[in-house]
Interface confidence: medium
């Protein structure tokens, strides 16, 4: 048991508890509320949150548990509206007395539905789709013969790709998939399709065979 | 009607302290960030400090930094400028003011130019 | 900081004439200026925002153009009304706002 000195008694101290899971997954447009409890003595003199190296100069609230002159426990709360796909990452709260500091960090990810970035046909034949959202979006292919409008033979990809997994996981994943479209002999439609938990994303190749094989494309929602 | 009336302005000595008041009328006063601004005789214009919307942020002008304080009681509709340690070069009119809603921005909430003012309350610093 | 700089610092015109008052940011403010209109004794009142737009109540006569670091507020036709001092703002950093030195127009 180490031994306490005299003056160590009055050290002040701030711990800070979080009243949410520090980890937090948050649909795009919805709205989230941080929310930190902390015992501070001496009094709190500063507080502020922060995300990507800038403070919030509004948007937060802090205040007192109890008006007891005795009461050393505040709450600290940011209120973040309409979050977009962009705002994921690492929001910080930071609290200070005059003897410590003290910090807790809330990563946000926001689920976003698939968007298709690019759809094309490559030079070697291959038809290519790039679709980015959280969670990691997953991207099949189907070919609908003639003028069918429901896509059901699935085909296989010949390559997948993430392109950005090396990075921080709070922004869009984005994924890149390929397959050959020499395997198409008739005319009709090949859906790539990106989906994930928040919604899905089609894009469509027209194959219309004339003298040369020409896909024309359009995109869904 | 949107109003802003000051009260709490008078004369103090050099070291002494005062405490503005500024009441808010017609408009969700817990919405708004709000500011002090001040003017001494024969000068312009001087921002002096600022509080978000919840009070839970605020800014100051370095020539009051350690010295006023800015709060806010949007139960009360009321601004506060706390002002200690006062000097002969914070005699002034005092003016609160309203920041407009005219932009948004992710860190900041919602800001702008100050489109509602008080008609403001003299502070005098002098033994 | 940003210092915000008018000129010139006193104008002297007559009823009719047109006014021309300047103002310049140490750096760019992008389109967030505001110019206000005080007279003695009575709440500045707020005139032009976002540079060129003009708030509720600003008679037409009166004109912003500007972005950046240079702006300009225009009179158009002067009326014995607009004696009064005149202030820049920027309001581009949103929790630390600066003033101009302001101008005195007169209308003899």
């Known amino acids: 048991q180490p031994s306490v000195s005299p003056g160590e008694v009055d050290k002040g101290f701030i711990n800070i508890f979080p009243m949410i899971n520090t980890t937090v997954f948050v649909n795009d447009g919805e709205n989230v509320d941080l929310i930190v409890e902390y015992e501070a003595f001496p009094k709190p003199e500063h507080q502020q949150w922060i995300y990507m190296n800038r403070t919030f100069t509004d948007k937060w609230e802090d205040y007192p548990k109890s008006e007891n002159e005795s009461n050393i426990r505040y709450v600290s709360e940011l209120h973040l509206t309409r979050l977009k796909g962009t705002e994921g990452g690492t929001y910080t709260f930071l609290v200070s007395n005059s003897d410590v500091n003290a910090a807790i960090a809330f990563n946000v990810y926001v689920n976003t539905k698939p968007e298709i970035l690019t759809y094309d046909r490559l030079v070697n034949g291959m038809l290519q789709c790039v679709a980015a959202g959280f969670p990691e979006p997953t991207i099949d292919w189907y070919f609908c013969p003639g003028t069918e409008q429901r896509c059901s033979a699935s085909v296989l990809p010949v390559d997948v790709q993430t392109l950005n997994s090396s990075g921080p996981p709070f922004g869009k994943l984005v994924v890149q998939s390929s397959i050959d479209s020499s395997a198409f002999k008739h005319n009709g439609t090949v859906e790539c399709k990106a989906y994930n938990d928040v919604g899905k994303t089609s894009a469509y190749f027209n194959f219309a065979f004339k003298e040369q094989i020409h896909p024309h494309h359009h995109h869904h929602h | 009607e949107v109003q802003l009336l000051e009260s709490g302005g008078g004369l103090v000595q050099p070291g002494g302290s005062l405490r503005l008041s500024c009441a808010a009328s017609g408009f969700t006063f817990s919405n708004y960030k709000m500011q002090w601004v001040r003017q001494a005789p024969g000068k312009g214009l001087e921002w002096v400090s600022y509080?978000?919307?919840?009070?839970?942020?605020?800014s100051y002008a370095d020539s009051v930094k350690g010295r006023f304080t800015i709060s806010r009681d949007n139960s009360k509709n009321t601004l506060y400028l706390q002002m200690n340690s006062l000097r002969a070069e914070d005699t002034a009119v005092y003016y609160c003011a309203r920041v407009a809603h005219q932009y948004y921005d992710f860190w900041s909430g919602y800001y702008g130019a100050f489109d509602i003012w008080g008609q403001g309350t003299m502070v005098t610093v002098s033994s | 900081d940003i210092q915000m700089t008018q000129s010139p610092v006193t104008l002297s015109l007559s009823p009719g004439d047109r006014a021309t008052l300047s103002c310049r940011a140490s750096q760019s403010v992008s389109f967030n200026l505001a110019w206000y209109q005080h007279k003695p004794g009575q709440a500045p009142r707020l005139l032009m925002f976002d540079a060129s737009t003009r708030a509720i109540g600003t008679p037409d006569r009166f004109s912003g153009s500007g972005s950046g670091t240079e702006f300009t507020l225009t009179i158009s036709s002067l009326q014995s009304e607009d004696s009064a001092v005149y202030y820049c703002?920027?309001?581009?950093?949103?929790?630390?706002?600066?003033f101009g030195q302001g101008t005195k127009l007169e209308i003899s």
């Open positions: 509080i978000s919307s919840s009070g839970g942020y605020t």
């Open positions: 703002q920027q309001y581009n950093y949103p929790a630390s706002y600066t």
